[in-house]
């Protein structure tokens, strides 16, 4: 009961952080900045991975895409990598997941199946909650350290000049959701690890082999060294030495702590 | 690279009226605010009138009520209508285009300015 209970536990709060990640990557505040203050009017930009946007104080606001993959930052083109990579583990494992629940029942399918099941849909959900952590980690070490704030640059040409601004961005409220989604996905992963642990079968696959103890199996016979070890002819055509190896289909022995291997 | 070209200057007598025209070419992600500074000479660069890209307008008190702010999103043209002209409207105008170039690349685009002369 404990390790379905684990084990459904974890599948929720693995898809609860999957949905945030996936919220997290669409979103488009990972970056917002205090671009033009004034007494009358206040514009603030902010920007996602995807498309950056511009908000008036009136509430009007305009989104629009990065023109080029080539013109956007390779830190940026990481993190991209790192949170859709995450995404489609998370959706992986989810899938894997849901027929590894232990109240679902498909077909014949073995405890056995549905624990590998178990324990791969929980390392899938680590590794995505990792790649989201990773993602946003970078980005916001990229905020941290003004990784694309310029001095004010100029650039002088026919029509005029144009002067690049140094600005400063600050945290956007997708990297929050980042970060907690990715937390919890990595803890919906452990849990299902920990199942699996539960949803493992009592008894082993393979023929376990016991070995005990044969001094019946060597007949000593007083008078000179005339012993039948059984390499010789048997006479009485009965078996002497065994060897002392059994299997436990063989001989019915007591469960004993030292009998599996 | 962006790039302003400004129209609309010249002489005109007190009272008299002009339309000044700042058309932007290149490449913009987003367009923050547009608008025009002035400066008359020996002095500094003053704010003459602003235009959100929501089309928010915002204008220095001594030209209220005289000057218009208006765009063409069309034609990616700013227009400053600039009515009852006195002497001290005398200046060069500066039209400027405040804007995002790319990720985290916010820039501001100056044209070469616009010579206003108001005497009689």
């Known amino acids: 009961m404990a390790v379905t209970a684990c084990q459904g536990l974890g599948f929720v709060v693995s898809l609860i952080g999957i949905a945030g990640i996936i919220a997290a990557t669409c979103m488009d505040q990972w970056s917002t900045q205090d671009l033009y203050n004034n007494p009358v009017t206040a514009v603030f930009n902010y920007q996602g991975l995807w498309r950056s946007c511009v908000r008036e104080s009136s509430g009007f606001t305009e989104c629009r895409g990065y023109f080029t993959l080539l013109g956007l930052p390779a830190m940026l083109q990481a993190v991209r990598a790192l949170m859709i990579v995450g995404i489609v583990l998370g959706a992986i494992g989810l899938l894997v997941s849901i027929f590894a629940l232990k109240c679902i029942r498909i077909g014949s399918m073995e405890d056995s199946a549905k624990a590998n099941m178990t324990l791969t849909s929980g390392i899938m959900f680590i590794v995505s909650g990792l790649c989201a952590i990773a993602g946003v980690s970078v980005f916001a070490n990229m905020l941290v350290t003004n990784f694309w704030m310029s001095t004010a640059n100029m650039y002088t040409g026919m029509g005029g000049m144009v002067q690049t601004v140094q600005t400063r961005y600050t945290f956007g409220a997708a990297l929050f959701v980042g970060w907690v989604a990715g937390g919890l996905t990595l803890i919906g992963g452990v849990m299902m690890c920990i199942a699996c642990r539960g949803l493992a079968p009592e008894e082993t696959n393979y023929k376990a082999v016991s070995y005990h103890a044969s001094g019946h199996s060597v007949a000593y016979k007083p008078g000179g060294f005339k012993a039948s070890t059984g390499f010789g002819s048997n006479t009485k055509n009965k078996k002497i030495y065994d060897g002392g190896a059994r299997t436990e289909d063989e001989v019915q022995s007591y469960p004993s702590k030292h009998d599996y291997v | 690279q962006v790039q302003l070209v400004e129209s609309g200057g010249g002489l005109v007598q007190p009272g008299g009226s002009l339309r000044l025209s700042c058309a932007a070419s290149?490449?913009?992600?987003?367009?923050?605010?547009t608008g025009w500074y002035r400066q008359a000479p020996g002095k500094q660069r003053d704010l003459v009138a602003t235009?959100?890209?929501?089309?928010?307008?915002n204008y220095a008190d001594a030209v209220k009520g005289r000057f218009t702010i208006s765009r063409d999103n069309a034609k990616n043209t700013v227009y400053l209508q600039m009515n009852n002209l006195e002497p001290e409207d005398t200046a060069v105008y500066f039209c400027?285009?405040?804007?995002?170039f790319g990720f985290g690349d916010r820039r501001v685009a100056w044209d070469q300015g616009t010579q206003v002369t108001v005497s009689s």
């Open positions: 400027y285009l405040d804007y995002i």
């Open positions: 290149g490449s913009i992600l987003n367009l923050m605010t």
């Open positions: 235009i959100t890209f929501g089309g928010t307008t």
